[in-house]
Amino acid sequence: QGWQAFKNDATEIIPELGEYPEPPPELENNKTMNRAENGGRPPHHPFETKDVSEYSCRELHFTRYVTDGPCRSAKPVTELVCSGQCGPARLLPNAIGRGKWWRPSGPDFRCIPDRYRAQRVQLLCPGGEAPRARKVRLVASCKCKRLTRFHNQSELKDFGTEAARPQKGRKPRPRARSAKANQAELENAY
């Protein structure tokens, strides 16, 4: 089955907090949630960037005709192509708690199809042939998913809906906790 591009446009999907893996709540700290007592700067979105397109999962809308041999759909169908980067753009103190962002390298996320939809199309054929009905599977939405370290790039782990959202307004925990005290938590953060 062939595809003929007709027109396209793009929708920018800025990933929500829940679309990224979260460490346990005890890894969050007051500095991440409230910069006011640490210099008065307002809180930033963990994935804030001056150039939004640099780090976002984009849904490119393509309108195409479905073809099957000499036959072509009576109407074009619209489907999505997933494009763009997934990950934090700027490393800011309030982004801690979202992951170990202070590291220079970390979990690899990809923007890939999340949901699909089936659409029935009618194909018109030349030479007086009877129209054919075909069901096509189209991408309905895109999502950031993590490349797991145990699988190939094509097999992606979905951290979409099950990730807990950060708890706002948590009480500060003492700074004095050592790296060792947190080691068990850190090892399980991903």
Epitope: N29, K31, G39, P46, Q85, G87, P88, A89, R90, L91, L92, P93, A95, I96, R98, G99, K100, W101, W102, R103, P104, S105, G106, P107, D108, R146, L147, T148, R149, F150, R175, A176, R177, S178, A179, A181, N182, Q183, L186, E187, Y190
Partner: antibody, heavy 119, light 111 residues
Framework: EVQLVESGGGLVQPGRSLRLSCAAS????????LHWVRQAPGKGLEWVSG????????DYADSVKGRFTISRDNAKNSLYLQMNSLRVEDTALYYC????????????WGQGTTVTVSS | QSVLTQPPSASGTPGQRVTISCSGS????????VNWYQQLPGTAPKLLIY???QRPSGVPDRFSGSKSGTSASLAISGLQSEDEADYYC????????????FGGGTKLTVL
């Protein structure tokens, strides 16, 4: 201009201690995570340690764990590396480096300070 | 022995396209983002590529990065004499307590 300047290197005997410092300027210091990376003469790069904004946001390479301690003083825009029980194999040029982008590589580097461990 | 494996040397003539490979495992490149650094003779390293294929501002688009499975590569097109340098790949390694690991470096010679 974004700048990191290392100091504190020198010649030291095995088993002794040394403290490296890194002074930052030209950027908002506490928006950066900071790291130490070393390079032995004629060899490649080796990451030593990294620190975020809190005492529990710290990582060490296995080769220095238990001997080196990384710390930062945001009020002084400074990063430190306390090196104890130094070994001959710790001889290297020590770079201070920072990352301003989550998981985005070390995008600012100092010029390095030389540590020589020899008897 | 470096955790990430790079060819010790590579070469090309001006204008050519050169590719440097970096091979790792499931605990580093397989699940984490890859960064590339350029170190010109006698200078500090410079970030060339981050997050597998992103260029920091100021890095020419002649430099590009890619990743597939447990390997990554750096491609330099339109090779110039000033590209003669050592190139290092790096990624977080999740083994044990984890650390940031570099490849052994590739010395690129522009003939």
């Amino acid at each position: 201009e974004v700048q990191l300047v290392e100091s504190g290197g020198g010649l030291v005997q095995p088993g002794r201690s040394l403290r490296l410092s890194c002074a930052a300027s030209g950027f908002t210091f506490d928006d950066y995570a900071l790291h130490w990376v070393r390079q032995a003469p004629g060899k490649g790069l080796e990451w030593v340690s990294g620190i975020g904004w809190e005492d529990d946001m710290i990582d060490y390479a296995d080769s220095v764990k238990g001997r080196f301690t990384i710390s930062r003083d945001n009020a002084k825009n400074s990063l430190y590396l306390q090196m104890n029980s130094l070994r001959v194999e710790d001889t290297a040029l020590y770079y201070c480096a920072g990352n301003s982008r989550g998981y985005g590589g070390l995008d600012v580097w100092g010029q390095g300070t030389t540590v020589t461990v020899s008897s | 022995q470096s955790v990430l494996t790079q060819p010790p040397s590579a070469s090309g003539t001006p204008g050519q396209r050169v590719t440097i490979s970096c091979s790792g495992s499931s605990s580093n490149i397989g699940g984490n983002t890859v960064n590339w650094y350029q170190q010109l003779p006698g200078t500090a390293p410079k970030l060339l590529i981050y997050s597998n294929n992103q260029r920091p501002s100021g890095v020419p688009d002649r430099f590009s990065g890619s990743k597939s499975g447990t390997s990554a590569s750096l491609a330099i097109s339109g090779l110039q004499s000033e590209d003669e340098a050592d190139y290092y790949c790096a990624a977080w390694d999740d083994s044990l307590e984890g650390s940031y690991v570099f490849g052994g470096g590739t010395k690129l010679t522009v003939l």
